[in-house]
């Protein structure tokens, strides 16, 4: 229970994670003017990865794509890489984690295919969750460089006679989302990799054998040792060889109207 | 058409306050910011301060802030201009305007003539 | 506060004839987001509300006739008339729409000779 539970757990909060890098992503504030040192400005610019925008007091707003590609900073470039990296593992991540769900059955699957298919989802959200936050930083690091140069050459020019401010750029609201988002995706990943351990069958030493008894299905170990019958407790929550028997997790996966897929 | 029309001429004596009107039509009222200008004896223009109609924030000249107070009303899509203590000084023809691209003020009313005179 | 400094107070002129005036602002009113200067021109006729000519220093408002014309950027502007016409006698504005509070020029009075 405890381990669909992680696993649920990881997949809700790894995709509220994803949606969150996504809209960081699109969002056009990812650097918002400085308004410290013109608190009275009437127009207020705010820039993006794909666009840069003037909000009027008046009301309108404008938009400009960055029509450019090889005109753009190498830094935009890679933020702009690292995010669609994000976006795209996690993506990948969450249809493969859809499949790995214990409470979603697809034929026959083993445990142990969900298990890998659990790890290799997590692994895919923590990556996903990395991108995002070493794009986030990036950006970030640029926005703050670029910020205290500009305060460096704050008054160009006209001899201190005309006051000619340059415009400044601040950490806008796209920054937090991605960085909460990706937090969230990398949370979610580590999860999965948590569920997966208690998902995967825990490997033996030796081969298991069935003594097959003429009056009573009872599976027999090497040594003597009785492993498992079909009424008994399967404490080690593995499968075992009756087809009938469920293991405690299965008993307590019947699909629900609280299940979100 | 767009059009801006604002009451009527007021006389009023030093110390009252009045109250001037600009009702609005042709357009959609809570989609454009309404600025107040003051045009004293046909000199320049003085910006008093605008409102935005759909949330109701208010900014102000500083020069104009404890004077005038700006409101709207959405029903009616009537915007209003409350002038307070009221002196000589005060007396100017007033406009209101509607905001526009650039911030520039693309439609105005027809004018208020305020006389303040005991 | 922004100050608009207009240039000359008054212009008399003959119909027909190119008509420059200036407008001089105490600060920057280019926005480096997009490229765009917040001076707006206006017409003014007495007894009447002023006009909207030009905003963004050079963009006409609609129904205005193209022999008006507005240039510069930064700190310096230029309003051109190119022909004079008899119904252009009015006075002109020129208005800081960067920073609040939006302040106006004193104005230039054009008249005819």
């Known amino acids: 229970m405890a381990v669909t539970a992680c696993q649920g757990l990881g997949f809700v909060v790894s995709l509220i994670g994803i949606a969150g890098i996504i809209a960081a992503t699109c969002m056009d504030q990812w650097s918002t003017q400085d308004l410290y040192n013109n608190p009275v400005t009437a127009v207020f610019n705010y820039q993006g990865l794909w666009r840069s925008c003037v909000r009027e007091s008046s009301g309108f707003t404008e938009c400009r794509g960055y029509f450019t590609l090889l005109g753009l900073p190498a830094m935009l470039q890679a933020v702009r890489a690292l995010m669609i990296v994000g976006i795209v593992l996690g993506a990948i991540g969450l249809l493969v984690s859809i499949f790995a769900l214990k409470c979603i059955r697809i034929g026959s699957m083993e445990d142990s295919a969900k298990a890998n298919m659990t790890l290799t989802s997590g692994i895919m959200f923590i990556v996903s969750g990395l991108c995002a936050i070493a794009g986030v930083s990036v950006f970030a690091n640029m926005l703050v460089t670029n910020f205290w140069m500009s305060t460096a050459n704050m008054y160009t020019g006209m001899g201190g006679m005309v006051q000619t401010v340059q415009t400044r750029y601040t950490f806008g609201a796209a920054l937090f989302v991605g960085w909460v988002a990706g937090g969230l995706t990398l949370i979610g990943g580590v999860m999965m990799c948590i569920a997966c351990r208690g998902l995967a069958p825990e490997e033996t030493n030796y081969k298991a054998v069935s003594y097959h008894a003429s009056g009573h299905s009872v599976a027999y170990k090497p040594g003597g040792f009785k492993a498992s019958t079909g009424f008994g407790s399967n404490t080690k929550n593995k499968k075992i060889y009756d087809g009938g028997a469920r293991t405690e997790d299965e008993v307590q996966s019947y699909p629900s109207k609280h299940d979100y897929v | 058409e767009f059009q801006l029309q604002q009451s009527g001429p007021e006389l009023e004596k030093p110390g009252a306050s009045v109250r001037i009107s600009c009702k609005t039509s042709?357009?959609?009222?809570?989609?454009?910011?309404m600025n107040w200008v003051k045009q004293s004896n046909g000199e320049s223009l003085e910006w008093i301060g605008n409102?935005?109609?759909?949330?109701?924030?208010?900014r102000y000249n500083q020069k104009f802030k404890g004077k005038a107070t700006l409101t709207v009303d959405k029903s009616s899509s009537t915007a209003y201009m409350q002038l307070k203590s009221l002196t000589s000084e005060d007396s100017a023809v007033y406009y209101c305007?509607?905001?526009?691209?650039?911030?520039?003020?693309?439609?105005w009313g027809q004018g208020t003539t305020l006389t303040v005179s005991s | 506060d922004i100050v608009m400094t207009q240039s000359p107070s008054s212009l008399t002129v003959t119909a027909g004839e190119k008509v420059t005036m200036s407008c001089k602002s105490s600060?920057?009113?280019?926005?480096?987001?997009?490229?765009?200067?917040?001076l707006t021109w206006y017409q003014q006729k007495p007894g009447q509300p002023p006009k909207l000519l030009i905003y963004?220093?050079?963009t006409r408002e609609s129904g205005v006739p193209d022999r008006f014309t507005g240039s510069g950027s930064g700190t310096d502007f230029i309003l051109t008339i190119s022909s004079v016409q008899a119904e252009d006698l009015a006075v002109y504005y020129c208005?800081?729409?960067?920073?609040?509070?939006?302040?106006f020029g004193a104005g230039t009075k054009l008249e005819l000779k």
């Open positions: 305007a509607r905001s526009y691209y650039g911030n520039a003020f693309d439609y």
């Open positions: 042709g357009y959609s009222f809570t989609g454009y910011n």
């Open positions: 409102i935005d109609p759909y949330y109701g924030g208010t």
């Open positions: 600060q920057n009113l280019l926005n480096n987001g997009n490229q765009k200067n917040y």
């Open positions: 963004w220093a050079s």
């Open positions: 208005q800081n729409d960067y920073s609040f509070p939006f302040t």
